[in-house]
């Protein structure tokens, strides 16, 4: 015959731990229901009772299967310069994240400590890796062939267009200049964009500074600032 | 409320070194950063550095990378800031600073300590 | 580094004017400027960050403007508590640095 089911509270056997979402109440000396996420032990068991569960009242949560007594409250309204990327709910907590054009560049348990805006890759280089939420840009020299004459943190390098006759070669910064009206061969007209992360997708204007100097990549370094990356612009 | 506390004003010979404490209230030490901005005599302001006292990371300023240390006592929710081999333009007011949200503008100030460098 | 010039270096003015206080920044900053009021012997205080948004407990006649690189603070009606020196900073990226500074006097 199958082991009979324990229905909790049951005292476990010597020896032996309570099952999963289940926990040991010292007191009652018995294995007791968990509270499921987004409820907290109202009344903690007995021998003969087990947990009583409850709701989490507006503001407060619990993320995982718990016996505490009082919900966990929700962090403060993010700022207005900050963007709430998951709302406050029974279940989660509220999650503030940099606003749009910068990253967390030093992050703590719940949202940023720190937020740095995303390095401009300049003429010449391209991004190679985008930029995320918690991650900078990373630019890339134009390898021959390609080219950006922009300041960005978003454009990638782009083929330069193919001539008939050239008038001016293209280079790294440059498309190529052809004689003749049409090229035979040429990319739509605009910048080729990298998808953006969360964070900056509703990109407002960024600064386009001019020297090759990146805003410092030591946040998350035990030392000081280390070189900039090549191609990028900053501070 | 926050409050930083830092150490009385102090008097160095050139080449010596000034190391200025900030103590820390009013808040979870670990949980923000700290920063330090001098203020030499008649003059504007100038931002050293920023450390980290939850897992030290530090962020220097150029200028200063080579003589400033930035440590900590998180037992006694201090700050200090060194700085080495003084020469007499390192007189100033030295300021402790922390800002509340993760964008570097100075909610919150100590009250100044002020290094005279004099041989 | 990203240079922060203040004009004018000094400023009369009588109480009930309204004054205006520029600084330039040698690059673009967006909008991530802050500016300060500091009185003599004191630390400096926040005034308003992110170039407008004036911080808790600053009264309405201080207000901010600009973005990319020129920045004004105004003081719509000057009251005598407000002579002091003004600062610009930008807090864009390392090194954060500040303008040299705005003496306001009394005419």
């Known amino acids: 015959l199958p082991a009979q089911v324990a229905f909790t509270p049951y005292a476990p056997e010597p020896g032996s731990t309570c099952r999963l979402r289940e926990y040991y109440d010292q007191t009652a000396q018995m294995c007791c229901s968990k509270c499921s996420p987004g409820q907290h032990a109202k009344v903690f068991c007995t021998k003969t009772s087990d947990t009583v569960c409850d709701s989490c009242e507006d503001s407060t949560y619990t993320q995982l299967w718990n016996w505490v007594p009082e919900c966990l409250s929700c962090g403060s309204r993010c700022s207005s310069d900050q963007v709430e990327t998951q709302a406050c709910t029974r279940e989660q907590n509220r999650i503030c994240t940099c606003r749009p054009g910068w990253y967390c560049a030093l992050s703590k348990q719940e949202g940023c400590r720190l937020c740095a805006p995303l390095r401009k890759c300049r003429p010449g280089f391209g991004v190679a890796r985008p930029g995320t939420e918690t991650s900078d840009v990373v630019c890339k020299p134009c390898a021959p062939g390609t080219f950006s004459n922009t300041t960005s943190s978003t454009d990638i390098c782009r083929p330069h267009q193919i001539c008939n006759v050239v008038a001016i070669p293209g280079n790294a910064s440059m498309d190529a200049v052809c004689t003749s009206t049409s090229p035979t061969r040429s990319m739509a007209p605009g910048a080729v964009h990298l998808p953006q992360p969360v964070s900056t997708r509703s990109q407002h204007t960024q600064p386009t500074p001019e020297p090759s100097t990146a805003p410092s990549t030591s946040f998350l370094l035990p030392m000081g600032p280390s070189p900039p990356a090549e191609g990028s612009t900053g501070d | 409320q926050v409050q930083l506390v830092q150490s009385g004003a102090e008097v160095k010979k050139p080449g010596a070194s000034v190391k200025v404490s900030c103590k820390a209230s009013g808040y979870t030490f670990t949980e923000s950063i700290i920063h330090w901005v001098r203020q030499a005599p008649g003059q504007g302001l100038e931002w050293m550095g920023w450390?980290?006292?939850?897992?030290?990371?530090?962020n220097y300023n150029e200028k200063f990378k080579d003589r400033v240390t930035m440590t900590r006592d998180t037992s006694i929710s201090t700050a200090y800031m060194e700085l080495s081999r003084l020469r007499s333009d390192d007189t100033a007011v030295y300021y402790c600073a922390r800002h509340e949200g993760p964008y570097v503008y100075f909610d919150y100030w100590g009250q100044g300590t002020t290094v005279t460098v004099s041989s | 580094d990203i240079q922060m010039t203040q004009s004018p270096s000094s400023l009369s003015a009588s109480v009930g004017d309204r004054v205006t206080i520029t600084c330039k920044a040698s690059q673009d900053v967006s909008t991530a400027v802050a500016w300060y009021q500091q009185k003599p012997g004191k630390a400096p205080k926040l005034l308003i960050y992110w170039t407008s948004t004036r911080h808790t407990g600053v009264p309405s006649r201080f207000s901010g403007s600009g973005s990319g690189t020129d920045f004004t603070l105004t003081i719509s009606s000057l009251q005598p508590e407000d002579f002091a020196t003004y600062y610009c900073q930008h807090h864009y990226s390392t090194p954060y640095t500040f303008g040299q500074g705005t003496k306001l006097e009394i005419k």
């Open positions: 450390f980290y006292p939850g897992s030290d990371n530090i």
